[in-house]
Interface confidence: low
């Protein structure tokens, strides 16, 4: 959780002098309760907005809006504490509106907004607005909370934000997998416009089984700028294992902002059609039994060799 760096947030408006301050989420009025405290916010609304940073990056932000109740307690309203809690991490970030002048009338309904909390795709937040000072112990609560779910990167507007784009939302590798002679697969995919490496994980399975019988990891070094958006062709040599005929090719990019967590794309080659009367299979060890070796991936040895080149 963080705050937008630009432009500087403003809470002052006609008839009110106000400044926005960072907050520890522990207002002084918790520790030193006051006798008279304001009523709670009214009509708290949270919407998804989008904002550019000073560098021009586009981020999703929580647009927080609320109004004041039309009662006399505004005479005791000294400000507000805005808190955003990310529910899956319990991380909390707060800011404080500090009123530098008193509110003395309701000629028009007082309305406040804040759009500087940067939020993440596919995350849920609890947004709370506390009027200050906070209530005395056992006093009526003077805050309002709402949950806010940020859409994931499938959302048309989210897709073009910096966090989504950097996790690969715009990358369409358009994978093709072709079976060649001599137990080989040719994998072709489109490189993205970033000098970052890729990994291809080939996982093979017996027909109608979910235990892998062959796994092979292939590393593709970072392309040069002139290779961006070009097709990369990789030839993978398969282990000639009986019945190990269904192959899943998964491509994992390592874009700078998502590192190990980038969106992966995959393609599958099915087993060839089985003949009506299958030939008897000789006795053999289970194909998925691990073999000794230094690789993290079973059966990932010299027989799973590969080579690649970029096609312009």
């Amino acid at each position: 959780l963080r705050l937008l760096d630009f432009p500087a947030p403003v809470c002052a408006q006609e008839g009110l002098s106000c400044r926005v301050k960072n907050s520890t989420c522990l207002d002084d009025s918790w520790i030193h309760p006051r006798n008279l405290t304001p009523s709670s916010p009214k009509d708290l609304q949270i919407q998804l907005h989008f904002a550019h940073t000073q560098q021009g990056d586009l981020f999703p932000v929580a647009h927080i809006e609320w109004t004041l109740q039309t009662d006399a307690s505004i005479l005791y309203l000294e400000g507000a504490e805005l808190s955003v809690l990310q529910l899956n991490t319990n991380e909390r970030l707060c800011v404080r509106f500090e009123f530098l002048s008193k509110l003395r009338h309701h000629h028009r309904r007082w309305r406040f907004t804040f759009s500087h909390f940067v939020v993440d795709p596919d995350q849920e937040y609890e947004v709370t607005v506390h009027h200050l000072p906070k209530p005395i112990p056992d006093g009526d609560p003077n805050h309002q909370s709402k949950n806010f779910l940020v859409p994931d990167c499938e959302h048309a507007r989210m897709k073009v934000t910096t966090p989504c784009m950097s996790s690969g939302s715009l990358w369409d590798p358009n994978i093709t997998v072709e079976t060649l002679e001599a137990h080989q697969l040719r994998v072709s995919f489109t490189l993205w416009n970033e000098s970052t490496h890729y990994q291809i994980l080939l996982t093979s399975f017996p027909h109608m089984e979910n235990h892998s019988c062959f796994e092979h990891m292939h590393h593709i070094p970072a392309p040069r700028p002139e290779e961006f958006h070009q097709r990369s062709n990789v030839t993978l040599t398969l282990r000639n294992l009986k019945g190990c005929c269904r192959h899943q090719v998964q491509i994992q990019p390592f874009f700078s902002s998502c590192l190990n967590d980038c969106l992966r794309h995959s393609a599958t080659v099915s087993c060839p059609e089985m003949p009506d009367t299958p030939e008897p299979i000789p006795d053999y060890m289970p194909l998925w039994e691990p073999r000794s070796g230094s690789s993290d991936y079973k059966d990932d040895d010299d027989k799973g060799s590969s080579h690649h080149h970029h096609h312009h």
Epitope: Q47, L87, D122, D152, A156, R157
Partner: antibody, heavy 116, light 107 residues
Amino acid sequence: QVQLVQSGAEVKKPGASVKVSCKASGYTFTRYGISWVRQAPGQGLEWMGWISTYSGNTNYAQKLQGRVTMTTDTSTSTAYMELRSLRSDDTAVYYCARRQLYFDYWGQGTLVTVSS
Amino acid sequence: EIVMTQSPATLSVSPGERATLSCRASQSVSSNLAWFQQKPGQAPRPLIYDASTRATGVPARFSGSGSGTDFTLTISSLQSEDFAVYYCQQYDNWPLTFGGGTKVEIK
């Protein structure tokens, strides 16, 4: 091919709960969220909520908040929708659908009848 | 919430004719709009997403247009299998909302 297969029809008494399942196949379950939509007899479609199969995040329709719970079991690629404190106006066909925003594949629907 | 209004409620068209269905949003939904077709006893079938992109396997006679608040689904030449109820749905903001539907019936 992508398929969403839902559990069978249910008849419930007012005040009871119902749990509808939706088993997905033909794609990587955790890649797309599951949404739930219901349709009362002779009426239009009503969005109930969504669950992220990856993070478990949920978003429920305001009117169902507190009565509905959506969950997933990634080991079986199954999504569940539980609705509690059933009322007669909850009588509807309940659909699961793939994706968070627009729905590209739908289950066949589960008729839930609430009657005393 | 964003209210989606479809018109007309019922459209009577002869086979081979052109059908134009309208969907209006109470506020702008950009191009985040989908159209579905539903026949009695069946689940809805996706036709269009992002206002104008045809879903997989949808015939070219179906086309979507519009952005902001006004959207149109056009069926250029109605086939017998096209008589059904059509729903629009916005996914620009929570909660997701559907229109009330337009029933396309044989004239």
